[in-house]
């Protein structure tokens, strides 16, 4: 099976960033965030 | 390599319906997000909306709320938009793309594989 590359260098212009809670250790799948300066940052 | 093939885009009255399909190869499927993104003439591409590794979240942009569902199946390695009530401003080309887990769903440059696209075009 191919490897999914990560590039983390993201260019965040006061965009909102979304995540998934399943994506930063939860099971739950709910959208998880927390507001820093504009960006939802997880 | 990961291979991504969109089918099911055409033209369909405003109003109307589509069902857009995105078949994954060549990757884990189970693994990873995965995401729709739209380019309109003279437009840079915008996120459409994503789903999650276990199909149980979706997460759309503000434009297409109510009107657009994502599904996946897993048994059949593949991701569904479903287009409903279209508009004309949803006339684009329709790309899905996969991205590795931990980034963020909604942004462009976290998507490092696209499909070749398929167009859909809206006319009243």
């Known amino acids: 099976d191919a490897e999914f590359r990560h590039d983390s260098g993201y260019e965040v212009h006061h965009q909102k960033l979304v995540f998934f809670a399943e994506d930063v250790g939860s099971n739950k799948g709910a959208i998880i965030g927390l507001m820093v300066g504009g960006v939802v940052i997880a | 390599e990961v291979q991504l093939v969109e089918s099911g885009g055409g033209l369909v009255q405003a109003g109307g319906s589509l069902r857009l399909s995105c078949a994954v190869s060549?990757?884990?499927?189970?693994?990873?997000?995965m995401g729709w993104f739209r380019q309109a003439p003279g437009k840079e591409r915008e996120f459409v909306g994503a789903i999650s590794r276990s199909g149980d979240s979706t997460y759309y942009a503000g434009s297409v709320k109510g009107r657009f569902t994502i599904s996946r199946d897993g048994a059949k390695n593949t991701v569904y938009l479903q287009m409903n009530s279209l508009k004309d401003e949803d006339t684009a080309v329709y790309y899905c793309?996969?991205?590795?887990?931990?980034?963020?769903?909604?942004?462009?440059?976290?998507?490092?594989?696209w499909g070749q696209g398929t167009q859909v075009t809206v006319s009243s």
């Open positions: 793309a996969a991205r590795p887990a931990g980034t963020p769903i909604n942004i462009r440059r976290a998507y490092n594989y």
């Open positions: 060549g990757g884990t499927f189970s693994s990873v997000g």
